[in-house]
Interface confidence: low
């Protein structure tokens, strides 16, 4: 084994390097000293390091490590942040288009319903947006509320347009009748199934991306332990104390040190792998009724069909509801 | 059949929705994201090696530093911590992850279970009991064209309308994207509904 070159007799090189880390030279000895107070860079002979320098090296080593970690995760972090933002924006746009489609369907097919229909449609799609963002809203309730609100308007404007104003207090009765008589057939149930499945998947997809960001953020901002700082200092800076400015750590030694420093972080690996594979599984299933783009952009058609279903059965329904709700002022249907 | 509101694209500036030549869909964008994420599947296990390869390490030099002395690069001493008695490397590993790492592992476990719970087996079609008159939603189209609901003559094909432009991604100021700064975690987030999936804490 070759003998180490003698340390710089004046510690000049060490001083000039250390000055870049810490302006002010008072911590660097003029000439090599015994260094008996050192705790990390334990000298085999005279050293150009002091206790204060050692502390600065430790701090710098840990900062270097944090920067290396941040640069390692930069591309991944950007990928997830960018996509989370893009998908969030895109889903909002889908909801907006779906609302516009539905409003256009009412405007072009049922203009007499528009003022109130626009209001109910707006409320429904607001709830959809809130649900995607994570609000505690039940999708079935959202759909029921939409149809409960629409039916009285459909009944009074389309099915029974000649109804006198005095009879317009039957709304509550009509809302009740809507469900009990299944006036829209099974279309509400179909919409519930489609919307709930597609929105659940959408919401968890976004949640997963947000958590991905949080995972990277957490490991990005890890503060490394003092023990790790000592190991890094010994690997990166202790050679300077001997005047060995140009020498680099051995590769195998670096790997051992990094595995020690990052033992905790590497424990994430198993769950990270599972996260990506689980997310892939979810994405592979996001089609047909599990694809909110398909479901929401097609809702106007299903709602249109549901109204056609009501119109097709209008005669029967009007008779039944006429009996049920005729005296709703005295006797509410529900 | 319902009037198809082609004229109702509001956000032409944002998305140039209907006239994108390469027609990048949400669906293809998701798949592209997964493929990119899969290239990072070994991210955490590869970190120690990555950091060593991106910090000064003796590659072509004959001599290298082993923490205590200058040694030949291929000698046994090169991989050994020269200051074994200083503190135990094994001990450092045994301390286990920091609380913050344990927390994030817990959250990953949580999301992984939710993701798998929500993952749907392929090939399922809509519930077929649409109504008394036997309306049913068939199994139609491919990923791009799907039948959504509807009765016999009311059944229409809905073309995926939302088309991406690559610019959408870059129009967003990523510095302002959620998560660019470390988020504070509430002390005790009590989620009172299984569907309340906004943030898992």
């Amino acid at each position: 084994q070759p003998p180490p070159p003698p340390p710089d007799a004046t510690c000049h090189q060490v001083r000039s390097f250390f000055q870049r880390l810490q302006p002010g030279l008072k911590w660097v000895p003029e000439t090599p000293v015994p260094g008996s107070d050192l705790q990390v860079c334990l000298p085999k002979g005279p050293t150009c390091c002091s206790r204060k320098m050692e502390e600065k090296y430790q701090l710098t080593a840990r900062l270097n490590m944090e920067q290396l970690l941040q640069s390692a995760s930069m591309e991944l972090k950007f990928l997830i942040i960018q996509n989370a933002a893009v998908f969030q924006e895109a889903f909002e746009i889908v909801v907006r288009h779906a609302k516009n489609y539905t409003n256009a369907m009412f405007k072009n097919n049922y203009p007499s319903l528009t003022p109130q229909a626009f209001e109910f449609v707006g409320e429904f799609f607001t709830d959809v947006s809130l649900y995607i963002l994570g609000s505690d809203i039940n999708v079935d309730d959202m759909v029921n509320e939409l149809f409960d609100s629409l039916f009285p308007v459909i009944y009074t404007q389309l099915m029974n347009p000649g109804l006198p104003d005095s009879a317009l207090d039957i709304n509550e009765c009509l809302r009740g009748a809507r469900r009990d008589l299944k006036v829209f057939g099974n279309f509400p149930k179909l919409i519930m199934t489609q919307v709930s499945k597609s929105l659940q998947v959408t919401r968890i997809f976004l949640q997963a991306l947000n958590l991905g960001i949080e995972v990277i953020n957490t490991t990005d901002h890890l503060k490394f332990s003092k023990d790790c700082g000592r190991m890094l200092t010994r690997m990166w800076y202790c050679s300077y104390c001997q005047g060995l400015m140009m020498v680099k750590p051995c590769g195998g030694y670096c790997n051992v040190v990094m595995q020690g420093c990052m033992a905790g972080v590497v424990e994430i690996d198993k769950y990270w792998r599972e996260y990506i594979l689980s997310l892939e599984e979810l994405v592979n299933g996001m089609y047909r009724i599990y694809d909110m783009e398909n479901v929401l952009l097609g809702l106007f058609s299903t709602i249109h069909d549901s109204i056609q279903y009501v119109q097709k059965n209008a005669g029967k329904l009007t008779t039944t509801i006429g009996k049920l709700c005729a005296h709703s002022q005295q006797r509410q249907y529900r | 059949s319902a009037y198809y509101p082609e004229d109702l694209f509001i956000d032409k500036k944002v998305l140039k929705v209907a006239h994108v030549e390469h027609e990048e869909t949400l669906s293809s964008r998701r798949r592209e994201l997964i493929q990119k994420l899969k290239s990072f599947i070994s991210f955490y296990s590869a970190l120690p090696g990555y950091i060593c390869s991106h910090s000064p390490v003796a590659e072509n030099d004959t001599l290298c530093w082993n923490g205590q002395e200058l040694v030949e690069r291929y000698s046994q001493k090169a991989a050994r911590n020269g200051m074994k008695n200083q503190f135990n490397l094994h001990e450092l590993k045994m301390k286990g992850p920091e609380p913050v790492v344990s927390q994030i592992i817990d959250k990953l476990k949580h999301i992984n279970q939710l993701l798998r719970t929500m993952s749907m087996p392929k090939g399922r079609v809509l519930d077929k009991n649409l109504d008394e008159e036997g309306f049913e939603s068939g199994d139609c189209g491919d990923d791009e064209d799907e039948c959504i609901g509807g009765s016999g003559d009311g059944m229409i094909k809905v073309k995926n309308q939302l088309r991406f432009l690559a610019e959408l991604a870059y129009d967003l100021d990523v510095d302002d994207a959620p998560g660019n700064s470390q988020q504070a975690t509430p002390k005790d987030n009590e989620i009172s509904t299984f569907h309340n999936l906004g943030n898992v804490h």
Epitope: T193 | D106, K107, Q113, T117, S119, N189, F194, H195
Partner: antibody, heavy 124, light 107 residues
């Protein structure tokens, strides 16, 4: 062998408090989500609360929300249920139950192992 | 919340007979339905999960079927130790809910 043993039940007046414990053994406790499920005398089962494997998330049934708090100590392999503002209708046998991982997709609300239960009686 | 309705409330059968227990959900629970067995003074035991999968150590005479809203637990040939209360449970929607139980008693 997986074992779950509940303790801490007893007689308490309405408005009072009680803390139930569940000692787990025979499996890696910190890897599993845990739940409390209760059974009123002569009645069916009712899920009460759930906690993730590391304790970061908790869920509660509406009937106990704001009154009960679930917690765990993975170092002690223990699950807890702090019950405050107890009501007559909280009288039941309380079971601690492990959440499963079937096919890696089983969510926490499928219970593969149960304790023998501890009886809580709320009465004046 | 999803309501699970079990029928019949009581089933009186002899050992060796076939038992068919029904569980109906108030809305679709996909296939996320489980069955538990509970004997007097004991904790429930998981028998079937995800509608048709037998849990570890459960004999082959127990089988489950169904999806959506209608589910069935079948015990092909009753053994003396099978006389107990059986509960169905869904985990599709929050909160998880149980049926009111079906008691299988000796005739």
């Amino acid at each position: 062998e997986v074992q779950l043993v509940e303790t801490g039940g007893g007689l308490v007046q309405p408005g009072g408090s009680l803390r139930l414990s569940c000692a787990a053994s025979g499996f890696s406790f910190s890897s599993y989500a845990m739940n409390w499920v209760r059974q009123a005398p002569g009645k069916g089962l009712e899920w009460v609360s759930y906690i993730t494997s590391g304790g970061s998330s908790r869920y509660y049934a509406d009937s106990v929300k704001g009154r009960f708090t679930i917690s765990r100590d993975n170092a002690k392999n223990s699950l807890y249920l702090q019950m405050n503002s107890l009501r007559d209708e909280d009288t039941a046998v309380y079971y601690c139950a492990r959440g499963t991982y079937y096919y890696g997709s089983g969510n926490y609300f499928l219970f593969d192992y149960w304790g023998q239960g501890t009886t809580v009686t709320v009465s004046s | 919340e999803i309501v699970l309705t079990q029928s019949p409330a009581t089933l009186s059968l002899s050992p060796g007979e076939r038992a068919t227990l029904s569980c109906r959900a108030s809305q679709s629970v996909s296939s996320y339905l489980a069955w538990y067995q509970q004997k007097p003074g004991q904790a429930p035991r998981l028998l079937i999960y995800d509608a048709s999968n037998r849990a570890t150590g459960i004999p082959a005479r127990f089988s489950g079927s169904g999806s959506g809203t209608d589910f069935t637990l079948t015990i092909s040939s009753l053994e003396p130790e099978d006389f107990a209360v059986y509960y169905c449970q869904q985990r599709s929607n929050w909160p998880p809910t149980f049926g009111q139980g079906t008691k299988v008693e000796i005739k």
